[in-house]
């Protein structure tokens, strides 16, 4: 979390960001609150991102004013202009770019002052791992396949069973390159499985940790997957 | 209210160029950008172009060589040129407008400019 | 280029009927998928923006789903005005494209 604070002749106000992630090709949110004011054409919003020229997005006397908006957020952002009136001057990054990566100042005016905060926004790719039997191999296998990520994530198997073992030598971990050229389809093969035991894969980078577990029975398979994103940090 | 209003020639000689203005109103051309969608008689729509608040635009890659979008925001008018028409260009020409200001829709149209490419 | 495949390309149907009418994209374009409806001589109408959102004044009977590639527009009660033509598009990637369209006739 930042929280920033004017430092001007007039009052300084609150400004507070949280640094996130972005998920390329899909949709953003950078975060960031303010002190609320009454009258919404009192409200200027800007953000800015550092190294770029022109404005990321500025929204001012109600409406957006984009007329020195940079090259590269053409019709990508947008503010919740529902919202403003209420503190929340967080802005909504469509299409999500490896390049949209950097930090970001939220800069806002009121009547009742100016305040800022910087944002870090990683960009990259996670997704969810799906882990099932692989009734194609010669012995019992598990296959963990998870669709998209970037950068090269690390692969970890575990099991409920045998904590603390190291299952390097019996797992076989692929990375394919997807058709955009940038993520890659993550593949891990865990062989030599045995029965009532609980497997997880650990699929992880510096973006995001995500995790499948099946657990395998004689009489049932139970899945259940989760992802976490690191570093999410308020300012 | 938001209106956008397409006035151009009518009629184009082959070989010749088309220019084309849309006038807004009830909304600035530096909160929004602006369409060009084209429809063939009798036929779908095809994107053809935006400019961008800032001013910066981009084109339909089928259209780069002979389109050039320009805008006015003080008149509030965006101008549409074509070049070197044929007779597959005879189309109704629309501009319109996005619902928010990252493209999700095209909310607002013009009424259309039939544009026959006939000598 | 994304390619928008509307299906079906024509539909007849009665008044009160229940029509769905899908749009598949070649490649994914996440929820950033409109829907239009055109009648002869007329400029296109937005009905639905962003998958689901329906646009304002259009009639709750209309309404979007779909993520990814696969988009449909429901008219959950159909009425004589909506004999039209209906358009899916795509606003995720350059070039912005739509579908070939789907005319709703009346059975």
């Known amino acids: 979390l930042i929280i920033g604070f004017g430092i001007s002749g007039r009052h300084s106000i609150t400004v507070t960001t949280v640094a996130s992630a972005g998920n390329i090709g899909e949709d953003g949110i950078l975060s960031c609150t303010f002190e609320p004011d009454i009258k919404l054409s009192d409200i200027v919003i800007q953000w800015l991102k550092e190294g770029v020229l022109g404005l990321v997005h500025e929204f001012k006397e109600g409406k957006d004013e984009l007329s020195e908006q940079d090259e590269m957020f053409r019709g990508r952002t947008a503010v919740f202009a529902d919202q403003v009136i209420v503190g929340n001057a967080s802005l909504r990054l469509k299409n999500v770019q490896l390049t949209d990566a950097g930090t970001y100042k939220c800069y806002i005016i009121t009547s009742k002052g100016k305040g800022n905060a910087n944002l870090e926004y990683k960009t990259g790719a996670f997704s969810m791992p799906e882990v099932n039997v692989d009734y194609n191999a010669s012995s019992e296998t598990l296959r963990c396949e998870a669709p998209r990520w970037f950068p090269q994530p690390t692969v970890v198997w575990a099991s409920q069973v045998d904590q603390g073992a190291n299952f390097s030598e019996v797992s076989n971990t692929s990375f394919e390159l997807n058709s955009e050229n940038v993520t890659m389809k993550v593949v891990s093969v865990l062989y030599n499985v045995t029965i009532n035991n609980t497997y997880s894969c650990m699929i992880e980078n510096d973006i995001a940790k995500a995790t499948g577990d099946i657990k395998v029975t004689e009489s049932e398979i139970k899945r259940r997957s989760h992802l976490q994103l690191l570093n999410s940090k308020a300012s | 209210q938001v209106q956008l209003v397409e006035s151009g020639p009518g009629v184009v000689q082959p070989g010749r160029s088309l220019r084309l203005s849309c006038a807004v109103s009830?909304?600035?051309?530096?909160?929004?950008?602006v369409q060009w969608v084209r429809q063939a008689p009798g036929k779908g729509l095809e994107w053809l172009a935006v400019?961008?608040?800032?001013?910066?635009?981009d084109y339909n890659a089928a259209f780069l060589s002979r389109l050039t979008i320009s805008k006015d925001n003080s008149k509030s008018t965006v101008y549409f040129q074509m070049n070197s028409l044929r007779a597959e260009d005879t189309a109704v020409y629309y501009c319109?407008?996005?619902?928010?200001?990252?493209?999700?829709?095209?909310?607002?149209w013009g009424q259309g400019t039939l544009v026959t490419v006939s000598s | 280029d994304i390619q928008m495949t509307q299906s079906p390309s024509s539909l007849s149907a009665s008044v009160g009927d229940r029509v769905t009418i899908t749009c598949k994209a070649s490649e994914k374009v996440g929820t950033y998928v409109s829907w239009y409806q055109q009648k002869p001589g007329k400029a296109p109408k937005l009905l639905i923006y962003?998958?689901?959102n329906r646009y304002t004044g259009v009639p709750s009977r209309f309404s979007g789903s779909g993520s990814g590639t696969d988009f449909t527009l429901t008219i959950s009660s159909l009425q004589p005005e909506d004999f039209a033509t209906y358009y899916c598009g795509q606003t995720y990637s350059y070039p912005f494209t739509f579908g070939q369209g789907t005319k709703l006739e009346i059975k």
């Open positions: 400019i961008w608040s800032s001013g910066s635009t």
């Open positions: 009830g909304f600035s051309l530096t909160s929004y950008g």
């Open positions: 962003g998958a689901s």
């Open positions: 319109a407008r996005d619902v928010t200001t990252i493209v999700e829709g095209f909310a607002h």
